[in-house]
Structures are given as structure tokens and as C-alpha cells.
Amino acid sequence: IWELKKDVYVVELDWYPDAPGEMVVLTCDTPEEDGITWTLDQSSEVLGSGKTLTIQVKEFGDAGQYTCHKGGEVLSHSLLLLHKKEDGIWSTDILKDQKEPKNKTFLRCEAKNYSGRFTCWWLTTISTDLTFSVKSSRGSSDPQGVTCGAATLSAERVRGDNKEYEYSVECQEDSACPAAEESLPIEVMVDAVHKLKYENYTSSFFIRDIIKPDPPKNLQLKPLKNSRQVEVSWEYPDTWSTPHSYFSLTFCVQVQGKSKREKKDRVFTDKTSATVICRKNASISVRAQDRYYSSSWSEWASVPCS
Amino acid sequence: RNLPVATPDPGMFPCLHHSQNLLRAVSNMLQKARQTLEFYPCTSEEIDHEDITKDKTSTVEACLPLELTKNESCLNSRETSFITNGSCLASRKTSFMMALCLSSIYEDLKMYQVEFKTMNAKLLMDPKRQIFLDQNMLAVIDELMQALNFNSETVPQKSSLEEPDFYKTKIKLCILLHAFRIRAVTIDRVMSYLNAS
């Protein structure tokens, strides 16, 4: 058993049929010694008396808010949560496996630049009685500070019969140099509590590996005289690290119709303009990627050919 | 500790081309190592990230773009003195700070070159003959060093009398390649910045 936060404790249980469970001793936070009784949740049934209560925790029915009272007055609370371990593996029931970039990916993180700011998100099908808390650091043995905000519900989607909820959090490394060469990864730890179930999820990464620039901005077309070709120009996204001559991007320019199966024109360039062939009912799209360290491409920025 | 904007005239910067070749060569070699040593811990997640130049050179600090010198987190107190007569400088306007930056890059390359050559000598003794360093990568390191053209004491190639542990050598190769790729990215960014300034 360990303390998650004040008056909230996590009991780690090996979860299998007829498991013996864990013996837990609760102590009432009071100077009083006599006349103390214990109850669980909203029940008025007295579970025991005295300053300490010893319980055998085996299942979710044994978890919950234990309260010690004296003469109708509440003295203190202890909330017990369960963390299940099945076949030596901690349960991951609360969050959905996003399977990208690999299986057992519950947290996904992205950074728009090298400033040390990043966003992580996760998915769940649970809509109520759900809380998250996020901690992060650079390295684990001698951790350096990363400050994370509160996790918020950022999107809701319908997937077949189920509703899917996306939560996200923004974090900022306390003293980040965009030009630094990372040797210690960022560690992100998410505590998830659903009703009386506790789970924790972690992700470890270098900012350089989670870079995904914003799409290029200000796409403009200029038809070339006596030609089917069009000059398309754009600018670096505002959120990208500066100076751009140091943090350079490379671009992919594509002309395609509405369907992905349609034919296309595609060209890669390090410049902020390119010449392509425009077709009726097609769009010109441009996306960006770090020129020197190939992490993710940005989303496309698009303009219609016409 | 930073690069001033007064840098060589455009088109006078022969090192940019060599630095692009360097990044390409080390990326290819790392990819080859990952594939060939698929049953060894050789991915970014599996290895320890070590920097053999730590406390010996200060490339990131010495080559910091002017725009980032206002960022307290980028300013490190490490100072290193270097010889300053490189041919990539290509202009009398070249500042002392830029010379410091380029000489730091030269020192990085020299250290990695020695490490790679020592390691290759060990790998050539491996009866499995599983992996060797790409001669192209070694040649590209050499070309960039020549383009930088700094005078510097030669570092003797480390020779070891004991029987090499090939497993450890291959893991060290992965660690070195990952670190060198990160440094090659920095070098490419620096050269691009200097070329544009």
C-alpha cells in the first residue's frame, strides 16, 4: 500500500481467483483514543472500533472511503483504491491502446517545435467517475523539472456503438534550450482513477522524436504564363522554432483530386515555393518536416487549384 | 559562445555540402546497424545516450545562433579555447566566435573518427564478420575535417591488447552512431545557419 495523495491510498493486488489479497491497517488521524468506530462509504454498518482498523482487501467491495467517527462526528477519511496486477502485468483497463506507433501505446505526445513545450493525449470509453493527474520530468534518476497543466477533455467521438473520449495535457520543460542535444528522455506519468480502480501509464521520449510541425501558412498560387504549371508559395508556421536558417524545414507539395486513388503530382523541396501542375477540381497541399531530423510530417495545408 | 550575424559571404561556405553528406552517411550507417544488429539493443529506446565529447568540446554552446543567446537555458558556462585558422571561414570578416564554433566541430569529428577507427579494427577481428563501419562514412568525416582545415594535435588511435568483447563492441557502436547522428544534425543546422547569414 502507498499514498497517492493526502488520505488516498493505493493497494496493489495480485488479481487471480481466490487470491489472498492484502492486509491493510488503517489509522484514524485523531488524538482521540476511545469510542472510535469505522464505516465504509455511505453505509452506517460499523466495521470495527478502535484507533486502527485491520482489513483484508481482496476485491473492489473492500475498497472505498473508510471513515472513522466519534459520537456522530467524522474524525478522518482514508480512500482505498485498487491497482490490479494480472499475470505479473498491471491492468490497463481505463485507457484505450492507440496502437500507434506500436502496440501498448496508451499515451501519445507531440511537440510543435523545440521549445520544450509538448502535448500528450489519451483515449478512453469511460465517461464518468474518472480523474487524471499528470507528472513529468527530464530523466528519472536526477529528474529535471517539467511542469504540466491539468488534463482536460479535448474531444468526443462516436466509434460504432461506443463514444470515445480524448483527454489531453500540455507540459513545458522548465529550462529548455531549443538547440540542446537531448541525452535524457522526458518521462510522462499519468495516474488514472476510475471509481475505485487506480492505474498508471507512462511514456518516455526525446522532444526531437515527437516533433510534428504545424502546417505551412499563407499558401498562395501564381499561374505561370503559357503553361499548365502553377507556382505555389508558402511560409514557415508561426509556431516553428527560430531562426529558420538553423531550424530548417523541408516540404512536400502535392496536387490531388478529392479521392486518394486519383492521380497526383508530387514534389519535395527545401524552398518555400515550388512549381506543380494544377488540374481542375484538384487541390494543392503542402506539408512540412524537420529538414535534418526526420520525425513526423505536419498535417497538410491546402488550397483549391481553381 | 554564440555565432554573430557577420559571417561569410553567400556561396563562400564549402562546409555545408560536406555536412549534408555527413548526416546522410551517419544516418545510413545507423540504419544499417539497426537492421544488421536487430537482436542487439540498438534502437534509440534501448541504448544509453552517451556523448563522448562531453566536457571536451562545447559545440552546441559555441555554435549557438545569435537569436538563442537571449535564452538563459542555452547559455552554459563551459568555455574551451581552440586554434582558429579554418578554411571554411572563407572571409576576413569571420569572427572569433565563429572560429571557435568551427574548431569545436573539428574536434568533435576528430574524436569520433578515432573512436570509429578503433572500433572498426575490433570489428574486423570478429569471426562472425557481422558488421563493419561504412568506409563512405569515414571518408565523409575526413572530407569535412579537411574542409574545416584546423591545425590540431593528432589523437593517437587507441589500441588494446586484450581480446575484444564483440557483443560489447557492437553495442558501443550503436551508442556511438546514435550520438554521432545527433551531433551531425547539430553540425548541419550550424552550417545551414552560417550559410544563410
Epitope: Q229, K263, R266, I277, R279 | -
Partner: antibody, heavy 118, light 107 residues
Framework: QVQLVQSGAEVKKPGASVKVSCKAS????????LHWVRQAPGQGLEWMGW????????EYAPKFQGRVTMTTDTSTSTAYMELRSLRSDDTAVYYC???????????WGQGTMVTVSS | EIVMTQSPATLSVSPGERATLSCRAS??????LHWYQQKPGQAPRLLIY???QSISGIPARFSGSGSGTEFTLTISSLQSEDFAVYYC?????????FGGGTKVEIK
Amino acid sequence: QVQLVQSGAEVKKPGASVKVSCKASGYTFTDYYLHWVRQAPGQGLEWMGWIDPENGDTEYAPKFQGRVTMTTDTSTSTAYMELRSLRSDDTAVYYCAANKELRYFDVWGQGTMVTVSS
Amino acid sequence: EIVMTQSPATLSVSPGERATLSCRASQSISINLHWYQQKPGQAPRLLIYFASQSISGIPARFSGSGSGTEFTLTISSLQSEDFAVYYCQQSNSFPLTFGGGTKVEIK
């Protein structure tokens, strides 16, 4: 599977014209760009131009501008390349090539030998 | 127009050995570079597109790398069926242009 079948070999006199055909099968004809590439005996490859069978748009290499015409007949899924004012240095194997991507060539015809000789 | 230069013109290699073919562009073409193989009496065949992207059905021993002005096609272990002429082609701008080719012959 996607296939391009070209017309047979031709022998032409200098100053004449030649029209080579390229019949496509195994895909929707208008879904791919069609290019013409030639290769003189013992020489390398030389791009001549492309046509979009969907709308008849064309782009020719400057070297062939004014001397070449590329057309298509969607009803028969056939592309044509006509080269006029033939010279002896036009002697080459002419290939049609197709792809969903405009700038490189995924599928090739077997080639048509055109000999220009007096 | 962009001029593509391939080297060497002829490469003599023993079966099982590694072959490295080079292609240089007269100006930077990013990764807009494609490789083809041509055997005598046959049409060319696409091997690699956009400098390093492999084609399904093409053996894994063929790999491409490079960007900007310098590109490499590597055949890791030459098989008898790999002896042919190899062409690079740029698609950075029209007109599309090919290199002069590298003939890979049996040593």
C-alpha cells in the same frame, strides 16, 4: 495487371512523320498520366512529354516542342505520339510509360523501334 | 534543364559483392530522384522512387539514399539477374531528365 502494348516497328524517311500507339489495359485509362520516353541505339533515356488522358492536357520537353503531338482516345484506351519532320537522329526505341504520379514511370510499354533512314 | 551525371559509366562487380552507383544533379533536387533498371532488349523497370522509397516486388537488396545533389543506389549482394544498366531520373522540375546510366557487368 496494368499493361501497355505498343504498335510495331516503323521505318521512315527524313522529313516524314511517325505516329506510335500505346494501348492500355488492366486499369481505368484516365486514372494514370501517360509519358513518352525515347532511347537512341546504345544511348540513355530521354523524356519527351506527358499527357493527361482525362482532359488532354499535355506538357512537352522544350526540345520536342512544335514537333511532337500527344493525343489519347479514351474509347479505346489508347495513347498516340506523333513526331514530325523526322531526322536520322530521331532513330530510337520509343516507349510509352504510365503512372498515377506525374513525375516518374511505374509501368512501361515494350517499346517501338522507329528507324529514320533515306 | 537539370543535368544528371552518373558514375561510374561501367562498374565491374563479382556476384555476391556490394555495388554502389552514384548519381549527381547539377542543382539541388531535394529527394526528387528515381532509379530504374534496364536489361538488354527490355523496357526500364522502376526500382526506387523519391531517393529511398522501395517498390513492392523489388528485392530488398536494392536500396537508395541521398538528397540535394548526391544520390546512391546500393545493391547489397549482386545476383546474376542484377547485371544491367541503371538510370537515375530527376523529377524536381520539367523537363524530366535522366542520367547517362551505369552499366553493372560481371567481373
